[in-house]
Interface confidence: low
């Protein structure tokens, strides 16, 4: 027979929630493990088990779905916390089983505390606006499935600590914040307050997220090379060191992979036999465009190394381009004592 | 103080049946896996049977079709029936706690009850 | 069935020894190990669980290594009340069982 599929502990699942909010918590097992859903498990007679390991504790245990109000209850495969409480942090197992089969899986769970202005350890959502690009919206996230369609909330909106209110370029509008032209200045965190009533009790959902207004699209260009140029030559005598930076710029272009490499004589530094070093920098401007300098670099130089081509290549979503070092071996200056010496030799 | 005491040992002939009751105090057995281990006079550990706190049991193969665990979490007492027994099945029964729902290691042990199988 | 092998299975020493015993698992049970102690006459004690966390109230000296298929129960200093009989024992899930197997045990006696 076979043992438990343990997928164990799911890290990339770090599941944070706010102290004293509902928290509804899928079992991973369907959503990135198994291939069937849990209706078709629980059709074929399997089980879904619940239970936990405390913070700093190792005791497994199992969940206590007696508590007043149903403060934790479970619904097919969504653990129910109605609302959370700090010590509820710990690292969760859900397990499917029969007398057959059997697959389980842990996540954790981190119960938050937030202050008056929604500072907390939480890792936030990142949220990209085009820079002056016309209206944008976000949405407030992870609200689905709290409370039935027939179920009205009401949705309060906050830039930092301050409620939106007759914001010049920012208005709310029910689960969506609308920017009519969005600027450097509207970098920030936004919070919204979601209040709903269920069985005589009022609960919050408090969600942040962070925005961040970058390039348009409008005004990106395929990516520019700075270095090389045709205004720098590297000239060099054989035995010193060659350095020729490629220095490239990349507007902003979502989810586009921004990449720079050299060619020596048409092939990459790896599949050849020269002994040469790169070093990669990036840095980033306001609106998230990209430079990447990448150093080429040959320790001691030789004659051969100097009538190599040296070209840098890029790459992003708008485009490909290269551009090729001007590279040449110094010239030695004429040695005249030595010239004069034998002008006069022998008269 | 948490205590597990077995109880319903005693010498029995081959082929007849027994059943063990460990009561336990001190915990509500619902929330813990619980398991039987014997020792044969002499020899080392064996794992008979567990059962977790949702009421799954899990038989050593040997023991299939023979023991059968069981537990009544309302008398906080666990449970072997042990049926057709046989001269090797004379040993100290142990019951134990899991250390959780359905870890597999023991943590909490009784002191024993002694099953002897003889004509 | 996975088999639990542990050797040696007896072995003598002072007090004040480093003492190693090793367990090993017929097939792969990843860090699903336990290691109990057992003097005569008592009920066996857990000291190690998970391969290498020592279970509540068991002194430093004591300390659990390994994964997969074989492991390694260390006492770094032997003390008197050490003299005992050492079990591993499989922790590992299976639809047929939680736990099972122990080893056959290592009887740690005074040289």
């Known amino acids: 027979s076979e043992r438990c599929d343990d997928w164990g502990l799911d890290t990339m699942r770090q599941i944070q929630v706010f102290e004293d909010e509902p928290a509804r918590i899928k079992c991973p097992l369907f959503e990135h493990f198994l291939k069937f859903n849990y209706s078709t498990a629980h059709s074929a007679g399997l089980t879904l088990i619940w239970y936990w390991t405390r913070q700093d504790r190792d005791l497994e245990e199992p969940i206590n779905f007696r508590l007043p109000e149903n403060r934790i209850s479970k619904e097919k495969d969504v653990l129910w916390f109605r609302p959370t409480l700090l010590n509820d942090t710990g690292n969760y197992t859900c397990m499917l089983r029969n007398t057959t089969y059997c697959s389980k899986v842990a996540f954790p769970l981190e119960v938050v505390q937030k202050d008056s202005c929604f500072n907390s350890p939480m890792k936030l959502p990142v949220h990209k606006l085009y820079i002056e690009y016309g209206i944008q919206r976000i949405t407030c996230p992870n609200v689905d499935g709290y409370f039935p369609s027939s179920v009205k909330p009401t949705i309060t909106w906050y830039m930092g600590c301050y409620k939106i209110q007759n914001f010049n370029n920012v208005i709310p509008e029910g689960m969506n914040l609308s920017f009519l032209i969005a600027l450097i200045s509207n970098n920030g965190n936004y919070t919204c307050v979601v209040t709903y009533p269920e069985n005589g009790r009022t609960f919050h959902l408090t969600r942040t997220l962070t925005v961040k207004v970058v390039g348009s699209p409008k005004n990106a260009v395929p990516p520019v090379i700075h270095s090389p140029n045709d205004h720098v030559v590297y000239e060099k005598e054989p035995g010193e060191e060659l350095l020729i930076p490629c220095t490239v710029y990349f507007s902003f272009l979502m989810d586009s992979r921004n990449e720079v490499w050299w060619t020596i004589d048409g092939k990459k530094p790896d599949d050849i036999t020269i002994d040469v070093t790169i070093n990669e920098s990036i840095s980033h401007s306001r609106t998230e465009d990209e430079t990447r300098t990448q150093i080429l670099s040959i320790k001691k130089v030789t004659s051969e190394d100097l009538k190599r081509s040296y070209v840098c290549h890029a790459r992003s979503a708008k485009g490909e381009v290269a551009k090729a070092a001007k590279v040449k071996q110094k010239v030695p200056a004429p040695r005249y004592t030595v010239e004069l010496a034998c002008g006069f030799g022998a008269t | 103080e948490v205590q597990l005491e077995e109880s319903g040992g005693r010498v029995v002939q081959p082929g007849r049946s027994l059943r063990l009751s460990c009561a336990v105090s001190?915990?509500?057995?619902?929330?813990?896996?619980m398991g039987w281990v014997r020792q044969a006079p002499g020899k080392g550990l064996e794992y008979v049977a567990v059962i977790s706190s949702d009421g799954f049991f899990y038989d050593a193969s040997w023991a299939k079709g023979r023991f059968t665990i069981s537990r009544d979490n309302s008398k906080n007492t666990l449970y072997l029936q042990m049926n057709s027994l046989r001269a090797e099945d004379t040993a100290v029964y142990f019951c134990?706690?899991?250390?959780?729902?359905?870890?597999?290691?023991?943590?909490?042990w009784g002191q024993g009850t002694l099953v002897t199988v003889s004509s | 069935d996975i088999v639990m092998t542990q050797s040696p299975s007896s072995l003598s020493a002072s007090v004040g020894d480093r003492v190693t015993i090793t367990c090993q698992a017929s097939?792969?049970?990843?860090?699903?190990l336990a290691w109990y102690q057992q003097k005569p006459g008592q009920a066996p004690k857990l000291l190690i669980y998970g391969a290498s966390t020592l279970a509540s109230g068991v002194p430093s000296r004591f300390s659990g290594s390994g994964s997969g298929t074989d492991f390694t129960l260390t006492i770094s200093s032997l003390q008197p009340e050490d003299f005992a009989t050492y079990y591993c024992?499989?922790?590992?899930?299976?639809?047929?069982?939680?736990?099972?197997?122990f080893g056959g045990g290592t009887k740690v006696v005074i040289k």
């Open positions: 001190g915990i509500d057995l619902d929330n813990y896996a």
């Open positions: 024992q499989c922790t590992y899930w299976n639809p047929d069982y939680i736990g099972g197997a």
């Open positions: 097939e792969n049970i990843g860090n699903g």
């Open positions: 134990a706690r899991d250390r959780g729902t359905s870890t597999g290691s023991l943590d909490l």
